[in-house]
Interface confidence: low
């Protein structure tokens, strides 16, 4: 039988009446165009909805937008278009919502051709009031908030000027011209690249990387011959052109660009690229594209300095056209990532790592599924997950994989069961243990979302026909109830719930279409009465994460420690609540070879935990570039995995000696870097 339809599924009592009393419809007084929705702050209940409608006239396009505000999680909306003087808002800039709970919002208005500058509307009280401000420039990008101070904004102008505001957009100052890319770093630092000759495109590979730590009073050139730069965790990366040819290499800094080291990564040519797939304060996942238009490359994982890299995964799918990769951080369990590889036969297969890239494996075949036509052996196959690449290829996949940090262990994704990803209509699968085991959750493609930290999962069938039914589960997707939320079906466009998965409200967005008109409509359903009581201690059970063999003493040890979580029992129908905090108990493990990556010049043969010397480097001195000096590495082949907390046990020796020689890096060495003040 289909999941949720067997006898074991107990029904949630009187749920129809409970949900009917908590279903709120709002019909928007708009012609259908586009709609965008933003939450303002966390747990505030404030939602802004911007609807835009373009009327094509013979000579030009006339635009109209409306702004709506809700302060009860979308149950009721108020038209506040008059607060922005009925101005047409440019949707490509979106609604710039301030960090944390600052309550700040910036909307960028459309202005007529001859105007001196753009116009913004600013609010610092969760969109209760807006102030109109005319800009001394035309913005090219959305306003960017400093992560440390929401009063500090930066923007690029259409003339490549870098503009900064210190008073939340009230007053603006151009701090530099000829800027290609600008990003906030930590401590209100701004990093940006500049061109000297013609343009950003013409000077690619000859750009300079600059830094200002005082919002434009003074500057420091921290790099030359720059192709691009990026920030990830505590690392600053720059791809730098080589002196002699058209190749470029990654350089990395952990001190805001004062000193640089050459990353031990392959150099790339003109047609190739580097991409930071994921980064935290411990390490980086870096994709290095293969030469030629292969559509794949190699994932490398860094050491704690971002300098020495280990090969993590070969043939990693990352298309150059459109730049699609399936790389997904499973946020519901530490150390877990999912991605796709392109096989020799050009089929696409899903791989998963549970130890932050140390080892990759196929996903275990779900118990309740059979292998499809892609499988050579009908009894042996794996689950393959549809993510960004499948969506870009217009497969019948409405959503990417979903996981939430506070819904521990839960991963929901579309997939197929076989030897590779199938182009057939996918089903929805769920894992409750962070990707170790999977179960078919729903037949066919669905939209899905997690509410109340995993206490409720909501799904809507992906259909070209109008819909009026929502499905929900209170036991992590084992059993499903269906609720008809309206008599009149709507053309469904999206599910919206507050980011963070703590809410118990879900908004179903869509439009109604009659003979003459078409209108936006939303239905907000509050599940609070389904989960009638607050969860108590008895509703939770102890769960050991990463447990694969309970009889093994190192069971659950990942990156040097194991974690026990308190998790809601599947049978408990109760509210985790908005203030729910994940309860976990870590314990340190003894070190094994698994807690070490292979050092520079070493690799791990398949199915072995020992690191052996790379044949091509045997007998050579291991030398690499660190802070612009050449270093000699004495190693027995191991280095601790970044973030690994193990103690005791195996302790391989590792020593680095300064060779007192300059590296052959064309990058600016610290003593050559120049500073200047405005």
């Amino acid at each position: 039988s289909a999941p949720g339809e067997d006898e074991e599924c107990g029904r949630v009592r009187d749920f129809v009446a409970k949900l009917a009393n908590n279903t709120h419809q709002h019909v928007f007084d708009d012609l259908r165009g586009s709609v965008s929705l933003s939450w303002v702050g966390d747990s505030t209940g404030v939602i802004l909805v911007l609807t835009t409608f373009h009327v094509p006239l013979v000579i030009m396009t006339f635009g109209q937008s409306k702004l709506y505000r809700s302060e009860d999680y979308g149950k009721n909306f108020k038209d506040i278009t008059d607060l922005i003087n009925n101005t047409f808002i440019r949707t490509e800039f979106g609604m710039a919502i301030g960090p944390e709970n600052s309550g700040k919002v910036v909307l960028t208005a459309e202005v007529s051709g001859g105007s001196r500058g753009g116009r913004i509307f600013r609010s610092s009280d969760f969109a209760k009031n807006f102030v109109q401000t005319d800009l001394p420039f035309h913005p090219l990008t959305q306003m960017m908030y400093s992560p440390q101070n929401s009063d500090y904004l930066l923007a690029l102008s259409t003339e490549n000027g870098l503009w900064v505001s210190k008073n939340f957009g009230g007053k603006w100052e151009e701090i530099h011209k000829a800027v290609c890319l600008a990003k906030w770093g930590s401590d209100n630092t701004i990093f940006f690249t500049t061109y000297a000759n013609g343009s950003c495109k013409a000077d690619l590979g000859a750009l300079e990387l600059w830094r200002t730590s005082d919002l434009g009073k003074s500057f420091k050139t921290i790099g030359v011959k720059i192709y691009s730069f990026g920030l990830g965790g505590r690392f600053l990366f720059a791809s730098v052109m080589a002196d002699k040819d058209t190749t470029r290499r990654i350089h990395v800094s952990t001190d805001q660009g004062d000193t640089w080291s050459m990353a031990q990564l392959p150099s790339v040519g003109q047609e190739q690229f580097y991409s930071i797939l994921a980064a935290n304060d411990d390490m980086v996942f870096m994709h290095v594209d293969e030469p030629g238009d292969t559509g794949f490359g190699t994932i490398f994982t860094s050491d704690d300095r971002g300098i020495v890299y280990s090969k993590s995964l070969d043939r990693h799918l990352y298309t150059t056209t459109g730049g699609e990769t399936d790389f997904t951080n499973v946020t519901s369990l530490r150390g877990v990532y999912i991605t796709s590889v392109l096989s020799e036969d050009n089929s696409i297969q899903t791989m998963i790592t549970f130890d932050q890239g140390g080892r990759w494996t196929h996903l275990r075949k779900p118990e309740n599924s059979e292998c499809d036509a892609t499988a050579k052996n009908k009894n042996e196959c794996s689950l393959h997950i549809h993510a960004s690449y499948s969506i870009s290829q217009k497969l019948n996949v409405p959503m990417a994989p979903l996981s939430e940090p506070n819904a521990v262990g839960i991963v929901i994704a579309h997939g197929s069961v076989g030897d590779a990803i199938s182009v057939m209509v996918p089903d929805v699968y769920i894992s409750d243990d962070g990707g170790y085991s999977w179960t078919k959750m729903l037949e066919g493609p669905h939209y899905y979302t997690i509410l109340d930290s995993g206490g409720i999962i909501v799904a809507i069938e992906h259909s070209s026909r109008p819909i009026n039914v929502i499905k929900f589960s209170t036991d992590e997707g084992q059993c499903w109830q269906t609720y008809t939320f309206t008599r009149d079906p709507i053309y469904f466009t999206g599910l919206a719930s507050e980011p963070g998965a703590r809410s118990m409200n879900i908004s179903i967005w869509g439009f109604t279409e009659s003979f003459l008109t078409s209108q936006w409509v939303s239905y907000t359903i509050d599940f609070k009465d389904i989960l009638e009581r607050n969860c108590e201690e008895k509703d939770y059970t102890i769960w050991l994460a990463h447990s694969t063999d309970p009889e093994d003493y190192e069971d659950g040890c990942i990156l040097g420690y194991k974690e026990q979580f308190l998790r809601l029992r599947k049978s408990s129908v109760c509210q985790n609540g908005r203030d729910y905090v994940v309860t976990k108990q870590p314990s340190i493990c003894l070190c094994s070879l698994e807690d070490f990556l292979c050092d520079f010049g070493y690799y791990r043969p398949e199915n072995d935990s020992k690191c052996v010397e790379q044949p091509e480097l045997k007998g050579h001195d291991l030398e690499f570039c660190l802070y612009g000096r050449e270093e000699h590495l004495t190693t027995n082949g191991y280095r601790k995995i970044p973030g690994d907390k193990c103690q005791g046990g195996v302790n391989p020796v590792r020593e680095v000696k300064d060779l007192k020689k300059k590296c052959t890096s064309n990058f600016l060495s610290p003593e050559k870097q120049n500073s200047k003040s405005n």
Epitope: D549, E551, D552, Y553, E554, C557, S587, I588, C589, L590, C591, S592, L593, E594, N607, D608, S609, K610, Q647, G648, G649, V650
Partner: antibody, heavy 129, light 107 residues
Framework: QVQLVQSGAEVRKPGASVKVSCKAS????????MSWVRQAPGQGLEWMGI????????SYAQKFQGRVTMTRDTSTSTVYMELSSLRSEDTAVYYC??????????????????????WGQGTTVTVSS | EIVMTQSPATLSVSPGERATLSCRAS??????LAWYQQKPGQAPRLLIY???TRATGIPARFSGSGSGTEFTLTISSLQSEDFAVYYC?????????FGGGTKVEIK
């Protein structure tokens, strides 16, 4: 040198409890697990359980579950094994043994086991009414 | 749990002769196996770990072989101090389990 010194012989009545200590010296205490093994008179060796000295986490053989408690005191580098609800068949010599299984590398082909390389001298526990 | 079976229970060998002791596991333990020697009134002593590696200070006449479920301890030329009880022990899956022991006695 590396050694494990156990507490002296004990005599207990049925239903009572006994707590045996094992003091480690000559190596870093937190670097190795500690197993407890017992041997009834004229019988073979029987493994009771293991303790990780870093976090104090334990794993016990099913047979002793609920009756055995293993603890450690890192300040004195001592491991303790307490056995409750004693019966006459618990009469045996109890050994602590350093068990470097914690430094094993758990990879798909299986872990590499180093064996219990250092043993205590044994503590005789006699259960008699 | 994994059951370890040793054979024979008793082995009578003359000094200077070769002794071959067997140990069988009820399921694969890979190479996670150790051999111990125990003399009367003494604690066991580790001889072999990882199925085939001699522990520190163990004479070369002791050797271990095997993998999976079948293991062998060989004493190439028995010395008088080698007459004792020998135990095998697996550490693939908890609980660790010992074989019943093989007593090597003087013929």
């Amino acid at each position: 040198q590396v050694q494990l010194v156990q507490s002296g012989a004990e005599v207990r009545k049925p239903g009572a409890s006994v707590k045996v200590s094992c003091k480690a010296s000559g190596y870093t205490f937190t670097k190795y697990y500690m197993s407890w093994v017992r041997q009834a008179p004229g019988q073979g060796l029987e493994w009771m359980g293991i303790i990780n000295p870093i976090g104090g986490s334990t794993s016990y053989a099913q047979k002793f579950q609920g009756r055995v408690t293993m603890t450690r005191d890192t300040s004195t580098s001592t491991v303790y094994m307490e056995l409750s609800s004693l019966r006459s068949e618990d009469t045996a010599v109890y050994y602590c043994a350093r068990d470097p299984s914690g430094i094993a590398a758990a990879f798909p082909a299986g872990r590499y086991y180093y064996g219990m390389d250092v043993w205590g001298q044994g503590t005789t526990v006699t259960v008699s009414s | 749990e994994i059951v370890m079976t040793q054979s024979p229970a008793t082995l009578s060998v003359s000094p200077g002769e070769r002794a071959t002791l067997s140990c069988r596991a009820s399921q694969s333990v890979s190479s996670n196996l150790a051999w111990y020697q125990q003399k009367p009134g003494q604690a066991p002593r580790l001889l072999i770990y990882g199925a085939s590696t001699r522990a520190t200070g163990i004479p070369a006449r002791f050797s271990g072989s095997g993998s999976g479920t079948e293991f062998t301890l060989t004493i190439s030329s028995l010395q008088s101090e080698d007459f004792a009880v020998y135990y095998c022990q697996q550490a693939r899956l908890g609980p660790w389990t010992f074989g019943g022991g093989t007593k090597v006695e003087i013929k």
